[in-house]
Protein backbone atom coordinates (compact mmCIF):
# COMPACT_ATOMS: atom_id res chain seq x y z
CA UNK A 1 0.00 0.00 0.00
CA UNK A 2 2.60 2.25 1.03
CA UNK A 3 4.75 1.55 -2.26
CA UNK A 4 1.54 2.62 -4.20
CA UNK A 5 0.99 5.44 -2.77
CA UNK A 6 5.08 6.52 -2.94
CA UNK A 7 4.85 5.42 -6.59
CA UNK A 8 1.48 7.37 -7.27
CA UNK A 9 2.80 10.84 -4.93
CA UNK A 10 5.90 10.45 -7.27
CA UNK A 11 4.02 10.45 -10.50
CA UNK A 12 2.05 13.68 -9.51
CA UNK A 13 4.76 15.67 -8.05
CA UNK A 14 7.14 15.02 -11.17
CA UNK A 15 3.77 15.40 -14.05
CA UNK A 16 3.61 19.12 -12.26
CA UNK A 17 7.12 19.53 -12.01
CA UNK A 18 6.58 18.60 -15.74
CA UNK A 19 4.38 21.38 -16.71
CA UNK A 20 5.90 23.77 -14.76
CA UNK A 21 8.96 23.24 -16.67
CA UNK A 22 7.09 23.77 -19.69
CA UNK A 23 5.65 26.83 -18.32
CA UNK A 24 8.88 28.26 -17.57
CA UNK A 25 10.61 27.48 -20.91
CA UNK A 26 7.33 29.27 -22.37
CA UNK A 27 7.42 32.11 -20.21
CA UNK A 28 8.73 35.55 -21.74
CA UNK A 29 9.42 36.76 -18.41
CA UNK A 30 13.46 35.30 -17.62
CA UNK A 31 14.60 38.64 -17.12
CA UNK A 32 12.92 42.05 -16.42
CA UNK A 33 14.27 45.62 -16.71
CA UNK A 34 12.64 48.91 -15.80
CA UNK A 35 14.44 51.70 -18.01
CA UNK A 36 14.34 54.74 -15.91
CA UNK A 37 15.44 58.37 -16.99
CA UNK A 38 13.86 58.00 -20.13
CA UNK A 39 12.28 61.38 -21.79
CA UNK A 40 9.70 59.46 -23.88
CA UNK A 41 7.86 57.01 -21.66
CA UNK A 42 8.47 54.65 -19.20
CA UNK A 43 9.70 51.26 -20.40
CA UNK A 44 9.16 47.65 -18.74
CA UNK A 45 11.50 45.37 -20.89
CA UNK A 46 11.51 41.59 -20.18
CA UNK A 47 13.17 38.61 -22.42
CA UNK A 48 12.59 35.27 -22.65
CA UNK A 49 14.07 32.07 -24.60
CA UNK A 50 12.59 32.48 -27.07
CA UNK A 51 11.52 36.45 -28.00
CA UNK A 52 12.47 40.15 -26.39
CA UNK A 53 9.37 42.29 -25.33
CA UNK A 54 8.88 45.68 -24.32
CA UNK A 55 5.78 46.72 -22.32
CA UNK A 56 5.16 50.62 -22.43
CA UNK A 57 3.21 52.66 -19.27
CA UNK A 58 0.53 53.09 -22.17
CA UNK A 59 0.06 49.26 -21.98
CA UNK A 60 1.10 48.78 -25.40
CA UNK A 61 3.61 45.83 -25.46
CA UNK A 62 5.70 44.46 -28.71
CA UNK A 63 7.75 41.35 -28.66
CA UNK A 64 9.85 40.26 -30.83
CA UNK A 65 11.21 36.70 -31.74
CA UNK A 66 14.82 35.80 -32.13
CA UNK A 67 14.63 34.65 -35.55
CA UNK A 68 18.51 34.36 -36.13
CA UNK A 69 20.77 31.37 -34.14
CA UNK A 70 23.88 32.38 -35.02
CA UNK A 71 24.05 35.83 -33.77
CA UNK A 72 22.44 34.62 -30.19
CA UNK A 73 24.31 34.30 -27.54
CA UNK A 74 26.11 30.69 -27.01
CA UNK A 75 24.58 30.98 -23.20
CA UNK A 76 21.42 31.15 -24.39
CA UNK A 77 21.67 27.93 -27.04
CA UNK A 78 22.58 25.97 -24.24
CA UNK A 79 19.54 27.48 -21.72
CA UNK A 80 17.20 26.06 -24.48
CA UNK A 81 19.11 23.11 -25.04
CA UNK A 82 19.11 22.39 -21.48
CA UNK A 83 15.16 22.83 -20.83
CA UNK A 84 14.13 21.27 -24.05
CA UNK A 85 16.25 17.66 -22.94
CA UNK A 86 14.53 18.17 -19.45
CA UNK A 87 11.13 18.63 -21.09
CA UNK A 88 11.70 15.57 -23.46
CA UNK A 89 13.24 13.48 -20.92
CA UNK A 90 10.25 14.20 -18.49
CA UNK A 91 7.59 13.33 -21.35
CA UNK A 92 9.35 10.28 -21.90
CA UNK A 93 9.42 9.67 -17.99
CA UNK A 94 6.10 10.08 -17.74
CA UNK A 95 4.63 7.90 -20.63
CA UNK A 96 7.27 4.80 -18.75
CA UNK A 97 5.61 5.83 -15.76
CA UNK A 98 2.13 5.62 -16.33
CA UNK A 99 2.31 2.05 -17.57
CA UNK A 100 4.74 1.33 -13.98
CA UNK A 101 1.76 2.41 -11.99
CA UNK A 102 0.68 -0.35 -9.58
CA UNK A 103 -2.62 0.57 -9.92
CA UNK A 104 -2.90 -0.09 -13.62
CA UNK A 105 -3.05 -3.49 -14.64
CA UNK A 106 -1.88 -4.08 -17.98
CA UNK A 107 -2.10 -7.90 -19.17
CA UNK A 108 0.08 -10.49 -17.43
CA UNK A 109 2.88 -7.63 -16.81
CA UNK A 110 4.70 -8.66 -13.33
CA UNK A 111 6.00 -6.42 -11.18
CA UNK A 112 9.75 -6.93 -11.45
CA UNK A 113 8.73 -5.50 -15.10
CA UNK A 114 7.18 -2.77 -13.30
CA UNK A 115 9.77 -2.37 -11.07
CA UNK A 116 11.98 -1.48 -13.47
CA UNK A 117 9.75 0.61 -15.52
CA UNK A 118 9.70 2.59 -12.28
CA UNK A 119 13.34 2.90 -11.96
CA UNK A 120 13.72 3.92 -15.64
CA UNK A 121 11.00 6.42 -15.37
CA UNK A 122 12.32 7.96 -11.94
CA UNK A 123 16.12 7.99 -13.53
CA UNK A 124 14.39 10.19 -16.43
CA UNK A 125 12.57 12.39 -13.91
CA UNK A 126 15.63 13.41 -11.94
CA UNK A 127 17.74 14.19 -15.14
CA UNK A 128 14.70 16.18 -16.20
CA UNK A 129 14.78 18.08 -12.87
CA UNK A 130 18.34 18.57 -12.73
CA UNK A 131 18.69 19.78 -16.56
CA UNK A 132 15.86 22.42 -15.85
CA UNK A 133 17.70 23.43 -12.91
CA UNK A 134 21.02 23.75 -14.78
CA UNK A 135 19.30 25.63 -17.28
CA UNK A 136 17.75 28.24 -15.19
CA UNK A 137 21.03 28.76 -12.85
CA UNK A 138 22.77 29.03 -16.42
CA UNK A 139 20.82 31.82 -17.55
CA UNK A 140 20.37 33.79 -13.93
CA UNK A 141 24.58 33.60 -14.27
CA UNK A 142 24.54 35.14 -17.10
CA UNK A 143 22.47 37.73 -15.79
CA UNK A 144 24.59 38.43 -12.68
CA UNK A 145 27.77 38.28 -15.56
CA UNK A 146 25.78 41.05 -17.64
CA UNK A 147 25.27 43.41 -15.03
CA UNK A 148 28.67 43.38 -13.45
CA UNK A 149 30.66 43.63 -17.24
CA UNK A 150 27.42 46.20 -17.84
CA UNK A 151 28.90 48.63 -15.33
CA UNK A 152 30.58 52.17 -16.43
CA UNK A 153 30.82 50.65 -19.92
CA UNK A 154 30.60 53.53 -22.67
CA UNK A 155 32.77 52.77 -26.35
CA UNK A 156 32.75 55.15 -29.29
CA UNK A 157 32.02 52.84 -32.46
CA UNK A 158 31.43 53.41 -36.38
CA UNK A 159 27.69 55.07 -35.63
CA UNK A 160 28.83 57.45 -32.62
CA UNK A 161 28.93 56.89 -29.46
CA UNK A 162 27.53 53.96 -27.53
CA UNK A 163 27.12 53.36 -23.74
CA UNK A 164 25.50 50.96 -21.84
CA UNK A 165 22.69 51.89 -20.02
CA UNK A 166 22.61 51.36 -16.29
CA UNK A 167 19.27 49.73 -15.41
CA UNK A 168 18.24 46.94 -12.96
CA UNK A 169 18.00 43.82 -14.30
CA UNK A 170 16.15 41.37 -12.34
CA UNK A 171 14.90 37.58 -11.83
CA UNK A 172 12.15 37.14 -14.05
CA UNK A 173 9.07 35.03 -13.28
CA UNK A 174 10.31 32.42 -14.95
CA UNK A 175 13.73 31.68 -13.14
CA UNK A 176 11.53 30.99 -9.84
CA UNK A 177 9.06 28.89 -11.96
CA UNK A 178 11.77 26.69 -13.33
CA UNK A 179 13.72 26.49 -10.07
CA UNK A 180 10.74 25.27 -8.49
CA UNK A 181 9.32 23.14 -11.03
CA UNK A 182 12.71 21.34 -11.53
CA UNK A 183 12.83 20.48 -7.84
CA UNK A 184 9.42 19.04 -7.49
CA UNK A 185 10.26 16.51 -11.06
CA UNK A 186 13.70 15.36 -8.97
CA UNK A 187 11.48 14.82 -5.72
CA UNK A 188 9.57 12.77 -7.75
CA UNK A 189 11.91 11.08 -9.60
CA UNK A 190 13.51 9.85 -6.04
CA UNK A 191 10.06 8.41 -4.77
CA UNK A 192 10.03 6.61 -8.08
CA UNK A 193 13.75 5.36 -7.41
CA UNK A 194 12.33 4.84 -3.97
CA UNK A 195 9.05 2.82 -4.90
CA UNK A 196 10.84 0.72 -7.03
CA UNK A 197 12.85 -0.93 -4.13
CA UNK A 198 9.57 -1.64 -2.79
CA UNK A 199 8.18 -3.12 -6.08
CA UNK A 200 10.78 -5.47 -6.69
CA UNK A 201 9.57 -8.74 -5.80
CA UNK A 202 11.49 -10.75 -3.19
CA UNK A 203 13.30 -14.14 -4.13
CA UNK A 204 11.56 -16.58 -1.46
CA UNK A 205 13.84 -19.80 -2.16
CA UNK A 206 13.39 -22.82 -0.19
CA UNK A 207 16.39 -24.70 -1.15
CA UNK A 208 15.66 -28.02 0.76
CA UNK A 209 13.42 -29.54 2.65
CA UNK A 210 14.44 -33.28 4.01
CA UNK A 211 11.76 -35.41 5.39
CA UNK A 212 13.42 -38.38 7.73
CA UNK A 213 10.70 -41.23 6.53
CA UNK A 214 10.94 -44.37 9.04
CA UNK A 215 11.35 -46.61 6.14
CA UNK A 216 13.86 -45.49 3.36
CA UNK A 217 15.49 -42.49 4.24
CA UNK A 218 14.29 -40.23 1.19
CA UNK A 219 15.48 -36.74 0.99
CA UNK A 220 12.55 -35.13 -0.91
CA UNK A 221 14.00 -31.60 -3.01
CA UNK A 222 11.25 -29.21 -4.26
CA UNK A 223 12.38 -27.76 -7.46
CA UNK A 224 12.74 -31.28 -9.27
CA UNK A 225 10.27 -30.04 -12.14
CA UNK A 226 11.77 -26.46 -12.67
CA UNK A 227 15.67 -29.04 -12.37
CA UNK A 228 14.11 -29.95 -16.03
CA UNK A 229 13.53 -26.50 -17.48
CA UNK A 230 15.96 -24.81 -16.12
CA UNK A 231 14.14 -23.06 -13.31
CA UNK A 232 15.61 -23.70 -10.34
CA UNK A 233 18.33 -24.05 -7.71
CA UNK A 234 19.37 -27.93 -9.41
CA UNK A 235 21.34 -26.85 -12.12
CA UNK A 236 23.61 -30.40 -11.91
CA UNK A 237 20.78 -32.77 -12.85
CA UNK A 238 21.40 -34.67 -9.43
CA UNK A 239 19.15 -37.45 -8.96
CA UNK A 240 15.99 -35.86 -6.55
CA UNK A 241 14.91 -39.25 -5.51
CA UNK A 242 18.18 -41.21 -4.64
CA UNK A 243 16.56 -43.82 -2.48
CA UNK A 244 18.24 -42.92 0.47
CA UNK A 245 22.09 -43.46 -1.03
CA UNK A 246 23.37 -40.19 -0.13
CA UNK A 247 26.20 -38.76 2.25
CA UNK A 248 24.80 -36.50 5.15
CA UNK A 249 26.37 -33.50 3.15
CA UNK A 250 24.26 -33.64 0.50
CA UNK A 251 21.38 -33.89 2.85
CA UNK A 252 21.89 -30.79 5.02
CA UNK A 253 23.93 -28.60 2.27
CA UNK A 254 21.36 -25.85 2.42
CA UNK A 255 19.77 -24.88 5.77
CA UNK A 256 15.84 -24.66 5.76
CA UNK A 257 12.96 -22.85 7.00
CA UNK A 258 11.04 -26.30 7.29
CA UNK A 259 12.62 -28.79 8.49
CA UNK A 260 11.04 -31.97 9.60
CA UNK A 261 12.72 -34.46 11.88
CA UNK B 1 27.35 46.06 -31.99
CA UNK B 2 24.45 48.65 -32.68
CA UNK B 3 24.87 51.00 -35.92
CA UNK B 4 23.17 53.89 -36.61
CA UNK B 5 23.18 55.85 -40.21
CA UNK B 6 22.09 59.56 -40.04
CA UNK B 7 20.45 60.65 -43.69
CA UNK B 8 18.59 63.94 -44.77
CA UNK B 9 20.46 66.87 -43.35
CA UNK B 10 21.42 69.94 -45.12
CA UNK B 11 21.28 73.67 -46.18
CA UNK B 12 17.56 75.10 -46.09
CA UNK B 13 15.85 78.64 -46.36
CA UNK B 14 13.84 79.79 -43.31
CA UNK B 15 10.40 78.47 -43.87
CA UNK B 16 11.48 75.67 -45.60
CA UNK B 17 10.79 71.78 -44.52
CA UNK B 18 13.53 68.88 -44.16
CA UNK B 19 13.68 65.19 -43.29
CA UNK B 20 15.80 63.58 -41.34
CA UNK B 21 16.01 59.52 -40.92
CA UNK B 22 18.03 57.10 -38.56
CA UNK B 23 18.77 53.84 -39.30
CA UNK B 24 19.69 51.46 -36.89
CA UNK B 25 21.22 47.99 -37.72
CA UNK B 26 23.26 45.23 -35.86
CA UNK B 27 22.34 43.23 -32.72
CA UNK B 28 19.05 44.69 -31.68
CA UNK B 29 16.19 42.39 -29.74
CA UNK B 30 14.37 45.08 -29.33
CA UNK B 31 14.39 49.46 -29.82
CA UNK B 32 11.97 50.72 -27.10
CA UNK B 33 13.06 54.29 -28.18
CA UNK B 34 13.66 55.95 -30.93
CA UNK B 35 14.24 59.91 -31.11
CA UNK B 36 16.40 63.03 -31.99
CA UNK B 37 18.73 65.49 -30.00
CA UNK B 38 19.99 68.83 -31.29
CA UNK B 39 22.95 70.74 -29.97
CA UNK B 40 23.35 74.39 -31.28
CA UNK B 41 27.09 76.00 -31.62
CA UNK B 42 27.48 76.85 -27.48
CA UNK B 43 24.60 75.69 -26.40
CA UNK B 44 23.52 72.40 -24.27
CA UNK B 45 22.58 69.07 -26.40
CA UNK B 46 18.21 68.97 -25.92
CA UNK B 47 15.65 66.90 -26.94
CA UNK B 48 13.86 67.55 -30.15
CA UNK B 49 11.63 64.82 -30.72
CA UNK B 50 11.38 60.86 -29.20
CA UNK B 51 9.07 57.99 -29.89
CA UNK B 52 8.50 54.77 -28.35
CA UNK B 53 7.84 51.24 -30.34
CA UNK B 54 3.94 52.00 -29.32
CA UNK B 55 4.20 55.52 -31.07
CA UNK B 56 4.05 57.86 -27.85
CA UNK B 57 6.04 61.11 -28.59
CA UNK B 58 7.26 63.47 -26.87
CA UNK B 59 8.63 66.93 -28.31
CA UNK B 60 10.93 69.48 -26.91
CA UNK B 61 8.75 72.71 -26.29
CA UNK B 62 10.80 74.88 -29.10
CA UNK B 63 9.61 72.45 -31.86
CA UNK B 64 5.54 71.54 -30.70
CA UNK B 65 3.55 71.79 -33.88
CA UNK B 66 6.60 72.38 -36.30
CA UNK B 67 8.52 68.68 -36.36
CA UNK B 68 6.71 65.32 -36.56
CA UNK B 69 8.42 62.50 -35.23
CA UNK B 70 7.43 58.80 -36.78
CA UNK B 71 9.30 55.38 -37.02
CA UNK B 72 9.05 52.19 -38.99
CA UNK B 73 9.21 49.06 -36.23
CA UNK B 74 10.17 46.82 -38.93
CA UNK B 75 13.15 49.04 -40.57
CA UNK B 76 13.96 50.00 -37.12
CA UNK B 77 14.16 53.75 -38.97
CA UNK B 78 13.36 56.71 -37.00
CA UNK B 79 12.35 59.67 -39.22
CA UNK B 80 12.11 63.80 -38.49
CA UNK B 81 9.94 66.03 -40.31
CA UNK B 82 10.56 69.31 -39.88
CA UNK B 83 8.24 71.75 -41.70
CA UNK B 84 8.71 76.04 -41.01
CA UNK B 85 11.89 76.16 -40.31
CA UNK B 86 13.79 78.89 -38.22
CA UNK B 87 17.30 80.06 -38.15
CA UNK B 88 17.30 79.12 -34.39
CA UNK B 89 16.95 75.72 -36.03
CA UNK B 90 20.64 75.58 -36.67
CA UNK B 91 22.27 72.82 -35.20
CA UNK B 92 23.69 69.64 -35.36
CA UNK B 93 20.81 66.77 -35.28
CA UNK B 94 22.05 63.71 -33.15
CA UNK B 95 19.83 60.09 -33.39
CA UNK B 96 19.42 58.45 -30.25
CA UNK B 97 18.40 54.91 -29.78
CA UNK B 98 17.24 52.56 -26.87
CA UNK B 99 18.31 49.50 -27.35
CA UNK B 100 18.19 46.08 -26.08
CA UNK B 101 21.00 44.03 -27.50
CA UNK B 102 20.99 40.81 -25.60
CA UNK B 103 19.76 38.86 -22.58
CA UNK B 104 20.08 41.45 -19.56
CA UNK B 105 22.37 44.29 -21.95
CA UNK B 106 20.32 47.86 -22.92
CA UNK B 107 22.21 49.77 -25.38
CA UNK B 108 21.80 53.83 -25.09
CA UNK B 109 23.15 54.73 -29.23
CA UNK B 110 24.30 58.05 -30.56
CA UNK B 111 24.46 58.90 -34.20
CA UNK B 112 27.47 60.53 -35.38
CA UNK B 113 25.40 63.67 -36.35
CA UNK B 114 24.04 65.70 -39.02
CA UNK B 115 24.34 69.21 -39.66
CA UNK B 116 21.04 71.30 -40.16
CA UNK B 117 21.73 74.83 -41.45
CA UNK B 118 18.33 77.04 -41.72
CA UNK B 119 19.55 80.22 -43.81
CA UNK B 120 18.48 82.56 -46.26
Known amino acids: MAVTACQGLGFVVSLIGIAGIIAATCMDQWSTQDLYNNPVTAVFNYQGLWRSCVRESSGFTECRGYFTLLGLPAMLQAVRALMIVGIVLGAIGLLVSIFALKCIRIGSMEDSAKANMTLTSGIMFIVSGLCAIAGVSVFANMLVTNFWMSTANMYTGMGGMVQTVQTRYTFGAALFVGWVAGGLTLIGGVMMCIACRGLAPEETNYKAVSYHASGHSVAYKPGGFKASTGFGSNTKNKKIYDGGARTEDEVQSYPSKHDYV | QVQLVESGGGLVQPGGSLRLSCAAS????????MGWYRQAPGKQRELVAGISTGGTTNYGDSVKGRFTISRDNAKNTVYLQMNSLKPEDTAVYYC??????????????WGQGTLVTVSS
Open chain 2, 26 to 33: GSIFNIPV
Open chain 2, 96 to 109: NVLVVSGIGSTLEV
